[in-house]
Interface confidence: low
Amino acid sequence: VTGSRVYPANEVTLLDSRSVQGELGWIASPLEGGWEEVSIMDEKNTPIRTYQVCNVMEPSQNNWLRTDWITREGAQRVYIEIKFTLRDCNSLPGVMGTCKETFNLYYYESDNDKERFIRENQFVKIDTIAADESFTQVDIGDRIMKLNTEIRDVGPLSKKGFYLAFQDVGACIALVSVRVFYKKCPLTVRNLAQFPDTITGADTSSLVEVRGSCVNNSEEKDVPKMYCGADGEWLVPIGNCLCNAGHEERSGECQACKIGYYKALSTDATCAKCPPHSYSVWEGATSCTCDRGFFRADNDAASMPCTRPPSAPLNLISNVNETSVNLEWSSPQNTGGRQDISYNVVCKKCGAGDPSKCRPCGSGVHYTPQQNGLKTTKVSITDLLAHTNYTFEIWAVNGVSKYNPNPDQSVSVTVTTNQAAPSSIALVQAKEVTRYSVALAWLEPDRPNGVILEYEVKYYEKDQNERSYRIVRTAARNTDIKGLNPLTSYVFHVRARTAAGYGDFSEPLEVTTNTVPSRIIGDGANST
């Protein structure tokens, strides 16, 4: 069982003789007369397990002491720290030829953790250890211990573990502490990236490249890397992480933005106060919620104030010219705090008797410069029907108008177009043909452009080719043409008249009268 002793964060202890409770029980060769396990008390009355040998009077000493098996835990290079006392031969009388002031340190790699014997030829020498001038004085009750500290390293190691051995060749030594450790670069956070515990490389100049992982609530900007140096120090930080949206760096962590603040992107910026007309009610906001009645357009940055739709345009004026209307208006009083205001025109055709019965004007109407997205405050509308009631609405819109559930940003005007000559009649039919008469019928013009006062029918014998024609006028949409010659081809044209004048004649209808006294009934445009 090992007790806890505090060592630097970059050192991982594999063996610490000072932390072992009870006997160490290392193997000595020879079993008697060489190294001996001796307990001494330190200044806190705690037993210290030491190994001592002091055969300075006898020549040709070869005393070995071997530790238990030490796992290497994946380390490729380990460090051995030895604290020891070594008697000065000059202080011992009569030992000049036999007394030594050094001992040798060895190691042996092995996968076997239960080797019972010391085989000297298996061990590889690490170094000869001598007492140097730098020692610490340790008070052990009634005595002062001159404690030397020496550190050696060995590697690269490849087997599961290893044994250490100490060879005495005739010195007076007490091994007070043996600590074996490897170095690691300890878990650290740099540039918001966490770098894990990393065992140092195999040789004393190697650098181990380590990829960092971003701390909670952060993401990579550039790949975070550091190099773990052989001494267990992190070197050359490269790359970094950035706090996620809704978080800012505080004390090396990414912490949520406070209420009333936000951060929209993963950047190194701090959280910002919510822009005008917006708020956040939770920590960690990536954007702020707009106040009631305020909105944020899709392409508005989170940093922009929330805005409103505009109010209605002002001072709408209309000017009717036959079947055209020019409209002009003024900008709204309130643009909603936005620059992207534009105007849409809505055209409705309304019944004269009931203005509430309005229908969209349809595609035949033309707008100059355009119907929607107008940037100017005027529009010209053409190709309207004459003598028709129209209502025009001018809508002011901006980037947030579509989010408004109750739009009230329009102004409207109702106008009536002037009367105009009607359009031509599309279809004329011969309903009944006899030897002496033809019954005609036709449709109202597509665009009457006013009140139809009468229809005019022009007809002539085909071979006369309009040199001699007759006119019949009627208010109805049908008429009987009498007094015709039998077996004769006639051509008929029909046109409508309003107060504004006649429209164009219809396409010609050719009909041939009968020779027999029976009636032929037809409805084509060219009955024969």
Epitope: E73, G74, D111, S158, K159, K160, Q194, P196, R211, S213
Partner: antibody, heavy 124, light 107 residues
Framework: QVQLVQSGSELKKPGASVKVSCKAS????????MHWVRQAPGQGLKWMGW????????TYADDFKGRFVFSLDTSVSTAYLQISSLKAEDTAVYYC?????????????????WGQGTTVTVSS | EIVMTQSPATLSVSPGERATLSCRAS??????LAWYQQKPGQSPRLLIY???NLADGIPARFSGSGSGTEYTLTISSLQSEDFAVYYC?????????FGQGTKVEIK
């Protein structure tokens, strides 16, 4: 869901070449390296090597250096294994499998998703 | 390279019985070991990673243990769908080698 879908079986003559594809979906292609594993008929699994999907750098196991080429088309999240100068002993099922490209706090690696395998038969 | 040795080559077990599969590495792999299951005509499926961690979606009757060079996969009560070939694989220094496999068959 996360998937690795490999191209269909191939029958080739000795000396020919073959190119096996492995299309990834359901995850960010460049966050995981792509590895190739061979399984000869009635045999066990053998790791062939891998390609870094971020840099395109391939690493080949010793037995697969020379005739084997790993490549990528990141625009379609696809890794490729090309074998040239085919021999009868190349007859096997070839699997692609993914591994996180970086540790991200975990010290342990494993193949968590495998392709369904592509059978390559080399016969005259 | 590290050699992975699985034993036994074939294990005959009755449904409901316990199955213990062994995997030995030629050197310490520090728990960097995964176990896979492979059924005929299918690709391998991850069961265990880091020697003892159960992969997502794997039933709790599978468990892994071991450290150093000796590792074990245990199936506490074999179900019919568990009869397959099982492979171990190390991730301690490339090349990452697989064991030769243990076939678990119905007794």
């Amino acid at each position: 869901q996360v998937q690795l879908v490999q191209s269909g079986s191939e029958l080739k003559k000795p000396g020919a070449s073959v190119k096996v594809s492995c299309k990834a979906s359901g995850y960010t292609f460049t966050d995981y390296s792509m590895h190739w594993v061979r399984q000869a008929p009635g045999q066990g699994l053998k790791w062939m090597g891998w390609i870094n999907t971020e840099t395109g750098e391939p690493t080949y196991a010793d037995d697969f250096k020379g005739r084997f080429v790993f490549s990528l088309d990141t625009s379609v999240s696809t890794a490729y294994l090309q074998i040239s100068s085919l021999k009868a002993e190349d007859t096997a099922v070839y699997y692609c499998a993914r591994i996180p490209l970086y540790y991200y706090g975990s010290r342990y690696w494993y193949f968590d998703v495998w392709g369904q395998g592509t059978t390559v038969t080399v016969s005259s | 390279e590290i050699v992975m040795t699985q034993s036994p080559a074939t294990l005959s077990v009755s449904p409901g019985e316990r199955a213990t599969l062994s995997c030995r590495a030629s050197e310490n792999i520090y728990r960097n070991l995964a176990w896979y299951q492979q059924k005929p005509g299918q690709s391998p499926r991850l069961l265990i990673y880091a020697a003892t961690n159960l992969a997502d979606g794997i039933p709790a009757r599978f468990s892994g243990s071991g450290s150093g060079t000796e590792y074990t996969l245990t199936i506490s009560s074999l179900q019919s769908e568990d009869f397959a070939v099982y492979y171990c694989q190390h991730f301690w220094g490339t090349p990452w080698t697989f064991g030769q496999g243990t076939k678990v068959e119905i007794k």
